[in-house]
């Protein structure tokens, strides 16, 4: 971790003052994937680019939030500023970031991660979301995501609210919450494993 | 239509201080920097400073520094330029330009500054 | 500080004619990680404001006849108007923003 958010810094910190607030001004209206808000613009307009790379990692998280800026520099025509963003990032992203468990063998064949199969079933049963949420904040959540999940009432529907950030997550997003529920209530994964 | 009218010429005494405005329309200065240029009589042009009206900070240069002040006010789309402490040598033509993020594609059409006692 | 030279200082031509001036900058101008050259050349006509021709060194303004084309990388530029009119003749500055602002001392072209 790290790598992106420094790639990102490298990138803005090369763009002069008038091109960066261009890109801040087309990151207000670029296409933002489901179940993530916008950085407001009064707090966008006046942030340096350490600031804004901060900004973006904390709201979007590393992976996305480099890919949002190398959309955004594209847009600008900066092509090959927005390539060497993306080679920077996906360096070595091969490898499950710290202290994830490789995937069993059956999850890694094509088709449905084990979160999805049993999303109605984690909807259901999961009664720890907090702890889930702590386990997620800062790696796969962002700030506003988890501010988001707890305000729900119940645990059903606090599940549902974060399974509505999914359609956005990569394999590895999803094993986080796996592993994070191995921890937390493993009884109930390995029930679902068996069914 | 993109516009930045600038105020009226100016006849001001040695060591007094003189305002300049420049007043945008047809955009929002805070989607932009603002750039000012000098231009003496028969002379080239010389880059004064920038401001970002966003958030008010600014660059000049350094001959500039401490002479020059750029100043917002958001809610008129209007940036002011005021010059201080003002000799012969700063009688001159002032020029405020839109930066748009590629260049200074729009100009003002100029304040003109004599400074006589 | 980035010093800009332009050369000539003058240049008399007659309608027609092609007409190249140059401008050399003190140090690069190009940043290699957005492979821009930033320098700009404007027109400025008598008594009125500057216009901006070309940007990033090679970049056509729109709107700006195609008889007017920006060449060079890192420190050595030039402005080229292919087949001079009457209109053309004013003073033309070059400027780089690669790192704050700074205008060359402008090459005036005049009719023979």
């Known amino acids: 971790m790290g790598r992106a958010r420094d790639a990102i810094l490298d990138a803005l910190e090369n763009l002069t003052a008038e091109e960066l607030k261009k890109f801040k001004l087309k990151l207000l209206s670029v296409p933002l994937r489901e179940g993530y808000g916008r950085i407001p613009r009064g707090a966008l307009l006046s942030m340096d680019a350490l600031d804004l790379t901060d900004k973006l990692v904390s709201f979007y998280l590393e992976t996305y939030g480099a890919e949002l800026t190398a959309n955004v520099l594209r847009d600008m025509g900066l092509q090959e500023m927005a390539g060497q963003l993306q080679a920077a990032t996906h360096q070595g992203s091969g490898a499950a970031p710290a202290g994830i468990q490789a995937p069993p063998q059956s999850a890694a064949k094509p088709g449905l991660h084990f979160i999805d199969q049993h999303r109605a079933a984690l909807i259901a049963r999961v009664t720890n979301v907090e702890w889930l949420l702590d386990a997620l904040y800062g790696k796969v959540l962002t700030d506003e995501q988890y501010q988001a999940v707890r305000a729900e009432p119940t645990n059903p529907s606090k599940m549902r609210k974060l399974f509505s950030f999914t359609p956005a997550w990569n394999w590895t997003c999803k094993d986080l919450l796996l592993q994070a529920l191995r921890e937390s209530q493993s009884y109930l994964v390995e029930d679902l494993e068996r069914s | 239509e993109v516009q930045l009218q600038q105020s009226g010429a100016d006849l001001v005494k040695p060591g007094a201080s003189v305002k300049l405005s420049c007043t945008a329309s047809?955009?929002?200065?805070?989607?932009?920097?603002i750039h000012w240029v000098k231009q003496r009589p028969a002379r080239g042009l010389e880059w004064v400073g920038r401001?970002?009206?966003?958030?008010?900070?600014?660059d000049y240069d350094p001959k500039f520094q401490g002479k020059a002040t750029m100043i917002t006010d958001t809610s008129s789309n209007t940036v002011y330029l005021q010059v201080s402490s003002l000799t012969s040598e700063d009688t001159a033509v002032y020029f405020c330009?839109?930066?748009?993020?590629?260049?200074?594609?729009?100009w003002g059409q100029g304040t003109s500054v004599t400074v006589s006692s | 500080d980035i010093v800009m030279s332009q050369s000539p200082s003058s240049l008399a031509v007659s309608a027609g004619e092609k007409v190249t001036m140059s401008c050399q900058s003190s140090?690069?101008?190009?940043?290699?990680?957005?492979?821009?050259?930033?320098l700009a050349w404007y027109q400025q006509k008598p008594g009125q404001s500057p216009k901006l021709l070309i940007y990033?060194?090679?970049t056509r303004k729109s709107g700006v006849p195609d008889r007017f084309t920006g060449s060079g990388s890192g420190t050595d530029f030039t402005l080229t108007i292919t087949s001079v009119q009457a209109e053309d003749l004013a003073v033309y500055y070059c400027?780089?923003?690669?790192?704050?602002?700074?205008f060359g001392a402008g090459t005036k072209l005049e009719l023979k």
């Open positions: 990033w060194a090679s």
């Open positions: 401001i970002d009206p966003a958030n008010g900070n600014t």
């Open positions: 140090q690069s101008l190009l940043n290699g990680r957005t492979r821009r050259n930033y």
């Open positions: 400027k780089q923003s690669y790192n704050l602002v700074t």
């Open positions: 047809g955009f929002n200065i805070e989607d932009t920097y």
């Open positions: 330009g839109r930066h748009d993020g590629y260049d200074m594609d729009y």
